[in-house]
Interface confidence: medium
């Protein structure tokens, strides 16, 4: 069957996000992928969205992330916009109202996004074949 247009949008956004480092992509987030064996796909998407929302809510106005130059400021604002878009699309794909995020493990935002991109690409390859 055809792949969800939302999935394509997510992959596109993740490609943009992982292309460029910013001052805050090395900051850590909860690693929901570390122990996700008994988690459904929808729960994974929901929890990923929750982690992203926590990140951008906390760091959107973070002076360390905004940087010292207009270019750094621009990159950070771009990062936040992409994270918000990703969050919105993941919620749409998950179709769940809320989900707990209790993991102790941490990973950098950069690695988190790379892992999420791999999962999304795998899902896309399955639904497009």
């Amino acid at each position: 069957h055809k792949c969800d247009i939302t999935l394509q949008e997510i992959i596109k956004t993740l490609n943009s996000l992982t292309e460029q480092k910013t001052l805050c992509t090395e900051l850590t987030v909860t690693d929901i992928f570390a122990a996700s064996k008994n988690t459904t796909e929808k729960e994974t998407f929901c929890r990923a969205a929750t982690v992203l929302r926590q990140f951008y809510s906390h760091h959107e106005k973070d002076t360390r992330c905004l940087g010292a130059t207009a270019q750094q400021f621009h990159r950070h604002k771009q990062l936040i916009r992409f994270l918000k878009r990703l969050d919105r699309n993941l919620w749409g794909l998950a179709g769940l109202n809320s989900c707990p995020v209790k993991e102790a493990n941490q990973s950098t935002l950069e690695n988190f996004l790379e892992r999420l991109k791999t999962i999304m690409r795998e899902k896309y390859s399955k639904c497009s074949s």
Epitope: F73, H74, K77, R81
Partner: nanobody, 116 residues
Framework: EVQLLESGGGLVQPGGSLRLSCAAS????????MSWVRQAPGKGLEWVSE????????YYADSVKGRFTISRDNSKNTLYLQMNSLRAEDTAVYYC?????????WGQGTLVTVSS
């Protein structure tokens, strides 16, 4: 061509007030979330305040909350920052910027100096 032109900066004594303006042109102003950002001498950029496209919701950095007020007049394509109870640490170049869409535009900035 997009233009953002700040004005209203200057020298003011501690405790004084200033009103900054930012005249916008070249884009659909009332579609854009707008921000004020400042840069103190030798320091990094500091986000100051943000206002939604319709002017309904405003956000402020803790350092200016209760002293600064952001507003906009969409009929005049102008963004404002009313600054009261100014302190020496508010000395900086103040920039207005579009920060809500997939692009960012900046003005040239206006210098605010708070000194006795």
């Amino acid at each position: 061509e997009v233009q953002l032109l700040e004005s209203g900066g200057g020298l003011v004594q501690p405790g004084g007030s200033l009103r900054l303006s930012c005249a916008a042109s070249g884009f659909t102003f009332d579609d854009e979330m707008m921000s004020w950002v400042r840069q103190a001498p030798g320091k990094g950029l500091e986000w100051v305040s943000e206002i939604t496209a319709g002017g309904v919701i405003t956000y402020y950095a803790d350092s200016v909350k209760g002293r600064f007020t952001i507003s906009r007049d969409n009929s005049k394509n102008t963004l404002y920052l009313q600054m009261n109870s100014l302190r020496a640490e508010d000395t900086a170049v103040y920039y207005c910027a579009t920060t809500g869409s997939d692009f960012d535009y900046w003005g040239q900035g206006t210098l605010v100096t708070v000194s006795s």
